[in-house]
Interface confidence: medium
Amino acid sequence: KVFGRCELAAAMKRHGLDNYRGYSLGNWVCAAKFESNFNTQATNRNTDGSTDYGILQINSRWWCNDGRTPGSRNLCNIPCSALLSSDITASVNCAKKIVSDGNGMNAWVAWRNRCKGTDVQAWIRGCRL
């Protein structure tokens, strides 16, 4: 599923991401935009043999199990395919674990490069939330 901007903002808010670990909803929507272009089925392969999955491009070396990433830790204890569902529950729950890990949203390269320090509230402007 490819979410609309406000549709995703509403879903993320419903799942408790607004101000989760101090990160406003705009940060999460911005991250999703530049990680996956709001596409729940996005997959991207990395040079280390791992793959990023879903709307927040969660990595198989650390966070989920895709059955083929050497040394996978699967810290979210889920199959990576669960992160590709049109229901974003699994992605949100895993993202909460990631953002609580110590580096905050710096874990997402796209957030670091495209969202951090910008007017992230623009990503939820005009949305009925």
Epitope: Q41, G49, G67, R68, P70, S81, L84
Partner: antibody
Framework: QVQLQESGAEVMKPGASVKISCKAT????????IEWVKQRPGHGLEWIGE????????YYNEKFKGKATFTADTSSNTAYMQLSSLTSEDSAVYYC?????????WGQGTTLTVSS | DIELTQSPATLSVTPGDSVSLSCRAS??????LHWYQQKPHESPRLLIK???QRASGIPSRFSGSGSGTDFTLSINSVETEDFGMYFC?????????FGGGTKLEIK
């Protein structure tokens, strides 16, 4: 136990298309990548590409882009590979395998012969 | 693409001999190297994963070693059922690639 059952041998004319199937049993089909591999005598094994059935995400070896197309039907736990514009170079045995990085589980292979 | 070069192309041995098969990668692939055996008209069978881990049900006479670019499959005291083709495969990057194979034949 994990099993991959491929469709039977095919004899096709040059220029035609063929669709090979790979039915998976014994594991959660949507969770693992299905890989496709080509084997021709004297050419060893070649990786064609892969599909994640749960999402339909696909990756192709550049060499096979435009030649192979992957699909999957999660209701029947079956992956498909269509090969188009067949030539004699496509005559080979085609395997599906479960993508664990390594390939512990293979189909029995589908022999494709392209001949006029 | 990562090239895998296997040597020798053919190895003629007598049952009871011990042999080593080589697989060399064109660039470092850490331990992401796997070995397969294939008999005529059969699918490949996984022997060794991640350079040195024996796959389920594989006899202890098969062992693997190496890291980076140089890898070895060793068969201690070859048995008649071991004859066939041996392939290596890398999963360090895409596209996945295979070696050209080593044929193990009876002398």
């Amino acid at each position: 136990q994990v099993q991959l059952q491929e469709s039977g041998a095919e004899v096709m004319k040059p220029g035609a298309s063929v669709k090979i199937s790979c039915k998976a049993t014994g594991y959660t089909f949507t969770t693992y990548w299905i890989e496709w591999v080509k084997q021709r005598p004297g050419h060893g094994l070649e990786w064609i590409g892969e599909i994640l059935p749960g999402s339909g995400s696909t990756y192709y070896n550049e060499k096979f882009k435009g030649k192979a197309t992957f699909t999957a039907d999660t209701s029947s736990n079956t992956a498909y590979m269509q090969l188009s514009s067949l030539t004699s170079e496509d005559s080979a045995v085609y395997y599906c395998a479960r993508g664990d990085g390594f390939y512990c589980y293979w189909g029995q292979g589908t022999t494709l012969t392209v001949s006029s | 693409d990562i090239e895998l070069t296997q040597s020798p192309a053919t190895l003629s041995v007598t049952p009871g001999d011990s042999v080593s098969l080589s697989c060399r990668a064109s660039q470092s692939i850490s331990n992401n190297l796997h070995w397969y055996q294939q008999k005529p008209h059969e699918s490949p069978r996984l022997l060794i994963k991640y350079a040195s881990q024996r796959a389920s049900g594989i006899p202890s006479r098969f062992s693997g070693s190496g890291s980076g670019t140089d890898f070895t499959l060793s068969i201690n005291s070859v048995e008649t059922e071991d004859f066939g083709m041996y392939f290596c495969q890398q999963s360090n990057s895409w596209p996945r690639t295979f070696g050209g194979g080593t044929k193990l034949e009876i002398k």
